[in-house]
Each structure stands twice: as structure tokens, then as C-alpha cells.
């Protein structure tokens, strides 16, 4: 089991539960979005393949002062096996295009829903 204690419940959380909670949070962000998310901040787009969770965190962690995505940042850190700091990009994270945070969240949400349907929880 992936250990994701600390943000959702006091002990280890089954990966399926953790993924569902992340999806629910992203849905919440997209549905409650009135003004441009994070003031229209731009982040590096990611490859939605291997290492996706760490790459997503590496992109989003650079956005500061945006309370709307703070919970998402914390949740993604539970899926990433190593500590991620602002300005840190792994060799897997190819920085080639920036997109608005709102689009980033939508793209990530669509992909995570697909993974959940296919039973890919890790």
C-alpha cells in the first residue's frame, strides 16, 4: 500500500482511495473556478506517463500564493516517492511548453479519471 497518511486519514490509505480523493479535489477545483485559477499562472506541461505524479508536483509546486491548489500539491506529494522542492525538475520532466494552471488541472484530471477506470491506482 502507498503510505499517504497525513492529509486524508491517520494511517496508510489504499491507493484506490488516494487516487479517488485526488480526482475529487481536481473536480472540486474545476467546478468552483470563477476567476482565472491562480491568477492565470503558467506552469510547465507534463508528459502524462511514467513519473507523472512527481512531474505534476514539480510543475505545480512552483506556484505560490494560490490557495486553490495547495491541497492538490499536498496530495501529489503523497504519490511522489521523493521530496520535491520549488525550482527542482527531474530529468524525466521535459520542460518545453507552459500552459495555464487551469488547463494543467483539466488535463491531469482527464488522465487520472482514465487511470481510475482502468484500475491503475499506483
Amino acid at each position: 500500500l502507498t503510505c499517504l497518511g497525513g492529509f486524508a486519514s491517520p494511517g496508510p490509505v489504499p491507493p484506490s482511495t488516494a487516487l479517488r480523493e485526488l480526482i475529487e479535489e481536481l473536480v472540486n477545483i474545476t467546478q468552483n473556478q470563477k476567476a482565472p485559477l491562480c491568477n492565470g499562472s503558467m506552469v510547465w506541461s507534463i508528459n502524462l506517463t511514467a513519473g507523472m505524479y512527481c512531474a505534476a508536483l514539480e510543475s505545480l509546486i512552483n506556484v505560490s500564493g494560490c490557495s486553490a491548489i495547495e491541497k492538490t500539491q499536498r496530495m501529489l506529494s503523497g504519490f511522489c516517492p521523493h521530496k520535491v522542492s520549488a525550482g527542482q525538475f527531474s530529468s524525466l520532466h521535459v520542460r518545453d511548453t507552459k500552459i495555464e494552471v487551469a488547463q494543467f488541472v483539466k488535463d491531469l484530471l482527464l488522465h487520472l479519471k482514465k487511470l481510475f477506470r482502468e484500475g491503475q491506482f499506483n
Epitope: P36, C38, N39, G40, S41, M42, V43, N62, V63, S64, G65, C66, G87, R95
Partner: nanobody, 116 residues
Framework: EVQLLESGGGLVQPGGSLRLSCAAS????????MDWIRQAPGKGLEWVSS????????RYADSVKGRFTISRDNSKNTLYLQMNSLRAEDTAVYYC?????????WGQGTLVTVSS
């Protein structure tokens, strides 16, 4: 207080060139990644280019690759965008931005119009 002031926009013919400048103040410019972002009339925001704190890391949108060059002079706290081989579709308001901060730390923009 963070301030970004763009200049250098104007009317230019297709195939022409312009150099945009962005004077930064209110933060330690040399420590931050910077972006150029544009908004064409009636369209959404489009990322154009980014440059790392030292200037060694640069990236471009496919639509401007090979035509635009981003650079910075940390001693002058200034960001630049050299725009060559301009096209009608480059017409937009160009914003200089402190990366990852959103509208809070963008300049007021400079209008670039490419027309014959």
C-alpha cells in the same frame, strides 16, 4: 512592490523585426525565471517564451521557435524579446511576467501590430 514595465511594441510590416524590453524592479530579478506571454485580440493567453534565472535555460512556443529570442541582462534588471520575421498572427499584447505568479506580477503589456 514588484513592477514590470514593457516597452518596444508598435506597428511593423510582415517580415519585420521588433525588440521588446521589460524593466523589472521590487524583487531580486536575477533569482527568478521570467516569461513572455501574449494575448491576441479576442483570444486567450498564450505562453511565448521562458528564460531561467541565469539566462542559460530558454524555451519557446512552437509558433515562435526560430524567429524569437528571449534574453536577459541581470545587471540591468531587464528582460528582452527579439522578434524577427514577424507575421500577422503575432499581433497581440505582449506581457512580461515573473514566472508562476499570474496576473499579480505581470506588466501592463505592450501592443505589437503586424500589418502591411
Amino acid at each position: 512592490e514588484v513592477q514590470l514595465l514593457e516597452s518596444g511594441g508598435g506597428l511593423v510590416q510582415p517580415g519585420g523585426s521588433l525588440r521588446l524590453s521589460c524593466a523589472a524592479s521590487g524583487f531580486t530579478f536575477r533569482d527568478y525565471e521570467m516569461d513572455w506571454i501574449r494575448q491576441a485580440p479576442g483570444k486567450g493567453l498564450e505562453w511565448v517564451s521562458s528564460i531561467g534565472p541565469s539566462g542559460s535555460f530558454t524555451r519557446y512556443a512552437d509558433s515562435v521557435k526560430g524567429r524569437f529570442t528571449i534574453s536577459r541582462d541581470n545587471s540591468k534588471n531587464t528582460l528582452y524579446l527579439q522578434m524577427n520575421s514577424l507575421r500577422a498572427e503575432d499581433t497581440a499584447v505582449y506581457y512580461c511576467a515573473k514566472a508562476y505568479t499570474g496576473f499579480r506580477y505581470w506588466g501592463q503589456g505592450t501592443l505589437v501590430t503586424v500589418s502591411s
